[in-house]
């Protein structure tokens, strides 16, 4: 079954496929796209109660 646009890997998850720098993996279309095409969660304000995860929009190292 196709999966929804949980688009990219999280801090604790390996990328499902390698992407070149400045590209990120969109799990819906199952390929690498420009990171700018995908929107990340709003940044946490300083002192937020739960630690902010690194953005899901990480280019593949």
């Amino acid at each position: 079954m196709r999966r929804g646009p949980r688009s990219l890997r999280g801090r604790d998850a390996p990328a499902p496929t390698p992407c070149v720098p400045a590209e990120c993996f969109d799990l819906l279309v199952r390929h690498c796209v420009a990171c700018g095409l995908l929107r990340t969660p709003a940044p946490k304000p300083a002192g937020a109660s739960s630690p902010a995860p690194r953005t899901a929009l990480q280019p593949q190292e």
Partner: antibody, heavy 117, light 111 residues
Framework: EVQLQESGPSLVKPSQTLSLTCSVT????????WNWIRKFPGNKLEFMGY???????YYNPSLKSRISITRDTSKNQYYLQLNSVTTEDTATYYC???????????WGQGTTLTVSA | DIVLTQSPVSLAVSLGQRATISCRAS??????????MHWYQQKPGQPPKLLIY???DLESGIPARFSGSGSGTDFTLTINPVETDDVAIYYC?????????FGGGTKLEIK
Amino acid sequence: EVQLQESGPSLVKPSQTLSLTCSVTGDSITRGYWNWIRKFPGNKLEFMGYINYSGTTYYNPSLKSRISITRDTSKNQYYLQLNSVTTEDTATYYCATPHTYGAMDYWGQGTTLTVSA
Amino acid sequence: DIVLTQSPVSLAVSLGQRATISCRASESVDDYGISFMHWYQQKPGQPPKLLIYRASDLESGIPARFSGSGSGTDFTLTINPVETDDVAIYYCQQTSKDPWTFGGGTKLEIK
């Protein structure tokens, strides 16, 4: 900040086609995912479908034969068309956009649709 | 489709006490080490408001009284302490598999 605003008729007759518009400001619909959700009387929420940055669409299979989501990038608007409506389509219709995990952090205020003869 | 079952359907809690809402999925909503489960609050005449995403991440601007936990199929939203402004319907939502689905909602009232 992203802002979304639904517009369209408040009353549609059975068997007609519902057409709604979502106008987006604060971001381009050429990035991200752009959803339609509805809330029925009785409080049930249903995800209807989306159109994404590339124009790819996904429709809930429960609606697949009746639904179409399109966009006009020059107007930064996207649209819902629902064919052959019945009284069961009476609901409040929302447009919304999710971030990368699919969690919808920006919503329109909603437009209430009644299907009645 | 993944079915999300929320319990209780309604909940009355005294001001300052803890409210706990459960959401159980018919199959796991975890993938790539992430739980694709989110929580919303909805008040009459307003759209749903995102509280928690990825099971436990607090959305920006949401008070720390709200917290989420769980993984796999069992998830919990906790409000502690409950305030008058928290009267609303709370929904869980999964985005692990198409079609995305919502729980049936839990109505929170003040005792």
